[in-house]
């Protein structure tokens, strides 16, 4: 749930926790599957191109609170959503890409030529 | 205290199934997964699987696939295995241990004889 | 699957003796949130398994503080400061890094 483009990470599980991932997935990962203390992550962000690409996977425990707040950067669009509910809870996480702001509408073309 | 209460033994023919149980007290169930590992005499501990009792999300070593299968039932906080077609190559003490970053408790374990 | 490779098979030693165990994986236990999930357990003869050691070097609750883990990466040793006979029994390692989840095939102590 995210308000004033924040969202706010959930709380961690006392047990490990399987999460589905996809261009994410750590050595340690078994049939896209990876485990963690921390929470399952689904990631929109915009490549060079400007193509939007999907990433997800597991964020440990260590940092991942400031990971999960979807703190706006400056010419980065991105989106993240983070979850600890169930297993394999990032399955349904579909964040969005932000809005283009109006100075993306006027540099847009100029950084990708 | 965390108590997995298993049953002694169970004595079963070739090619049935079998369903051991694991009842679990002095914790909340759902808060941990329920392990089951197998030891035979000299072939030491065999990791079978996992259960996530607040999900009935399950994990298998690949090994025991279409051999094992867990379940739950969270209103009795009681874990199941059941083993099908079973053979004298099951024959072993069956464990379900109590996991959450590691197992820290270990039920009695059940001792299973698969002869006719 | 990860091999735990356990030194020695048998380990005969003397009450009071200091006693050491050693475990070796075939990969890393590193898992990639950056803990190390290398446990150690006792099984008495006709007993269950219990929880001494757990990450590398934690002792679980209630064991005597004769008992340390050590090592990292791919190596590890539990040490036994000074062995009395409640300790006798196999001792075996175990990793939750990888699934599946593996064991050492175990260190017999004994008495001399």
């Known amino acids: 749930k995210k308000e004033d483009g924040e969202s706010t990470a959930p709380t961690p599980r006392p047990k490990i926790l399987r999460c589905k991932c996809h261009h994410h997935c750590p050595e340690d990962s078994v049939n896209n599957i990876c485990s963690t203390d921390g929470y399952c992550f689904t990631m929109i962000e915009e490549d060079d191109s400007g193509m939007p690409v999907v990433t997800s996977g597991c964020l440990g425990l260590e940092g991942s609170d400031f990971q999960c707040r979807d703190t706006p950067i400056p010419h980065q669009r991105r989106s993240i959503e983070c979850c600890t509910e169930r297993n394999e809870c990032n399955k349904d996480l579909h964040p969005t890409l932000p809005p283009l702001k109006n100075r993306d509408f006027v540099d847009g073309p100029i950084h990708h030529k | 205290q965390v108590q997995l209460q298993q049953p002694g033994a169970e004595l079963v023919k070739p090619g049935a199934s079998v369903k051991l149980s694991c009842k679990a007290s002095g914790y909340t169930f759902t808060s941990y997964w329920m392990q089951w590992v197998k030891q035979r005499p000299g072939q030491g501990l065999e990791w079978i699987g996992e259960i996530d009792p607040s999900d009935n999300y399950t994990l298998y070593n690949q090994k025991f696939k279409g051999k094992a299968t867990l379940t739950v039932d969270t209103s009795s906080s009681t874990a199941y295995m059941q083993l099908s077609s079973l053979t004298s190559e099951d024959s072993a003490v069956y464990y379900c241990?109590?996991?959450?970053?590691?197992?820290?408790?270990w039920g009695l374990g059940t001792t299973l004889t698969v002869s006719s | 699957d990860v091999v735990m490779t356990q030194t020695p098979l048998s380990l005969p030693v003397s009450l009071g003796d200091q006693a050491s165990i050693f475990c070796r994986s075939s990969q890393s236990l590193v898992h990639s949130t950056g803990n190390t999930y290398l446990h150690w357990y006792l099984q008495k003869p006709g007993q269950s398994p219990k929880l001494l050691i757990y990450?590398?070097?934690n002792r679980f609750s209630g064991v005597p503080d004769r008992f340390s883990g050590s090592g990292s990466g791919t190596d590890f040793t539990l040490k036994i400061s000074r062995v009395e006979a409640e300790d006798l029994g196999v001792y075996f390692c175990?990793?939750?890094?990888?699934?599946?989840?593996?064991f050492g095939s175990g260190t017999k102590l004994e008495i001399k």
């Open positions: 241990a109590r996991f959450g970053y590691y197992v820290d408790y």
């Open positions: 990450k590398v070097s």
């Open positions: 175990s990793q939750s890094t990888h699934v599946p989840f593996t």
